[in-house]
């Protein structure tokens, strides 16, 4: 694929300020492109702050795509763990505070708050109920605590992140996972089933992170969240692989799973919900 192809691709992503990342393309969403090949590639996920695997279609897409995990880390995670710890200690804003408000593509019209980097204040906006980005808070206070500066130029409160000793990944402290498991998959797999805001009754599956299994639920046809899959297989492919089972205090063993050579759909890009 050529640079020209990337340049021609119409993307819908907002970008983080270049100074916050080694390269601005590290902030692009994984883009599998308009083709249908099944190629294992890696991208930098700004929300988990890790390089992660995705399936690339083989053409176009964008520059946040690497042949190997090492190449991705080299391009996008220079001293990443250290930088994040330092960020928390120095009370700088998390990168997502600089994302533009994004209501997503649904029609829920829920009142939420986002940090407006132009005005340097948290402001109200209408969230559609699905997709969007992490610059999205349920309360004004939460937004201020995480993104606004205090009177001394520091944040009002720390954004609590903990360094995971297993693979130097960062997970929000609020993530509730049974102690028997550690989760290293997409963050939406940890969210509860959400049937959404409409009146349909569509058969869908969600990942139940408490029991570590994909379970059916009835989806209303719009809204909801990204923990929403059209088949059990798709659900398992996206979420099951993220769990590592702890068999003793020291040892880690990956849960067994058969890998099917099928397109892995990236939930936040593939769930296309709207009333027609």
């Amino acid at each position: 694929d050529s640079e020209e192809d990337e340049e021609h691709t119409i993307i819908t992503d907002t970008e983080l300020p270049p100074l916050k990342l080694m390269h601005s393309f590290c902030a692009f969403k994984a883009d599998d492109g308009p083709c249908k090949a099944i190629m294992k590639r890696f991208f930098f996920n700004i929300f988990t702050r890790q390089c992660e695997e995705f399936i690339y279609g083989g053409c176009e897409g964008n520059q946040n795509r690497f042949e190997s995990l090492e190449e991705c880390k080299k391009m996008c995670t220079r001293d990443n763990a250290n930088r994040i710890i330092k960020t928390t200690l120095q009370q700088e804003k998390p990168d997502f505070c600089f994302l533009e408000e994004d209501p997503g593509i649904c029609r829920g019209y829920i009142t939420r708050y986002f940090y407006n980097n132009q005005t340097k204040q948290c402001e109200r906006f209408k969230y559609g109920g699905c997709l969007g980005n992490m610059n999205n808070f349920e309360t004004l206070e939460e937004c201020k605590n995480i993104c606004e500066d205090g009177p001394n130029g520091f944040q009002v409160d720390n954004y609590g992140t903990q360094l995971n000793a297993v693979n130097n990944s960062l997970t929000p402290q609020s993530t509730k996972v049974p102690s028997l498991f550690e989760f290293h998959g997409p963050s939406w797999c940890l969210t509860p089933a959400d049937r959404g805001l409409c009146r349909a009754n569509e058969n869908r599956f969600y990942y139940n992170s408490v029991i570590g299994k994909c379970r059916p639920f009835k989806y209303s046809g719009c809204g909801g969240n990204e923990n929403n899959f059209t088949s059990k297989q798709e659900c398992l492919r996206a979420c099951k692989k993220g769990f590592i089972q702890r068999i003793s205090k020291g040892g880690l063993i990956k849960t067994k799973r058969k890998r099917k050579k099928q397109r892995v759909k990236i939930a936040y890009e593939e769930i296309f919900v709207k009333n027609m």
Epitope: E4, H8, I10, I11, T12, D13, P34, C35, G57, C59
Partner: antibody
């Protein structure tokens, strides 16, 4: 809810100019790529032009390159199509459409442009 | 330029299955998307990425894409499905449309 409303169409003589507008609401306009697609009377859909939302890149079909210009005003949530040196074959209904990934998920109702002497 | 070829018209009786094809050299590699357009209205996406149905689109609409041909299938066709249908793909940053197929529901 997402709404796209086109305006600015009308009757114009060959060689003349026209500016179409597309007023967008119900979504964060500035982060989406947008396109113009046209449909001549009794004919099929023809892509005209696209832009890339938060970036400045613009793209045109060969049939309009050098004559049409796509632009946007994010503060007004509006997409524009400046059409110069109009020809009879430009007569069509012009639709504004939002690009989601690699397809068009929302369309306006269209505005009719007639090029005739 | 890149061509997506559709039959100009397809006829079907109510309750029967309608199949509309779209052929193009790059379809084995690229996704196809389908739009329905009723007279005097804007197009509406009915299938995206070969076989995905947006919410609000009836289950009788389905799609497939194999070889050089993408197919839109409407099972149990209803009178309200009478419309023009267009396939669309994306090649080197440019969207391309098929010529369109007029679906007539007989009777």
């Amino acid at each position: 809810q997402v709404q796209l409303v086109e305006s600015g169409g009308g009757l114009v003589q060959p060689g003349g100019s026209l500016r179409l507008s597309c007023a967008a609401s119900g979504f964060t306009f500035r982060v989406y790529g947008m396109s113009w697609v046209r449909q001549a009377p009794g004919k099929g859909l023809e892509w005209v032009s696209s832009d890339r939302g938060s970036r400045s890149s613009t793209y045109y079909a060969d049939s309009v390159k050098g004559r049409f210009t796509i632009s946007r005003d994010n503060s007004k949530n509006t997409l524009y199509l400046q059409m110069n040196s109009l020809r009879a074959e430009d007569t069509a209904v012009y639709y504004c459409a939002r690009v989601y990934r690699y397809w068009f998920d929302y369309w306006g109702q269209g505005t009719l442009v007639t090029v005739s002497s | 330029s890149y061509e997506l070829t559709q039959p100009p018209s397809v006829s079907v009786s109510p309750g029967q299955t309608a199949r509309i094809t779209c052929s193009g050299d790059n379809l084995p590699k690229y996704y196809a998307h389908w739009y329905q357009q009723k007279p005097g209205q804007a197009p509406v996406v009915v299938i995206f990425r070969d076989s995905n149905r947006p919410s609000g689109i009836p289950e009788r609409f389905s799609g497939s894409n194999s070889g050089n041909t993408a197919t839109l299938t409407i099972s149990g066709t209803q009178a309200m499905d009478e419309a023009d249908y267009y396939c669309q793909s994306w090649l080197s940053g440019t969207p391309w449309f098929g010529g369109g197929t007029k679906l007539t529901v007989l009777g």
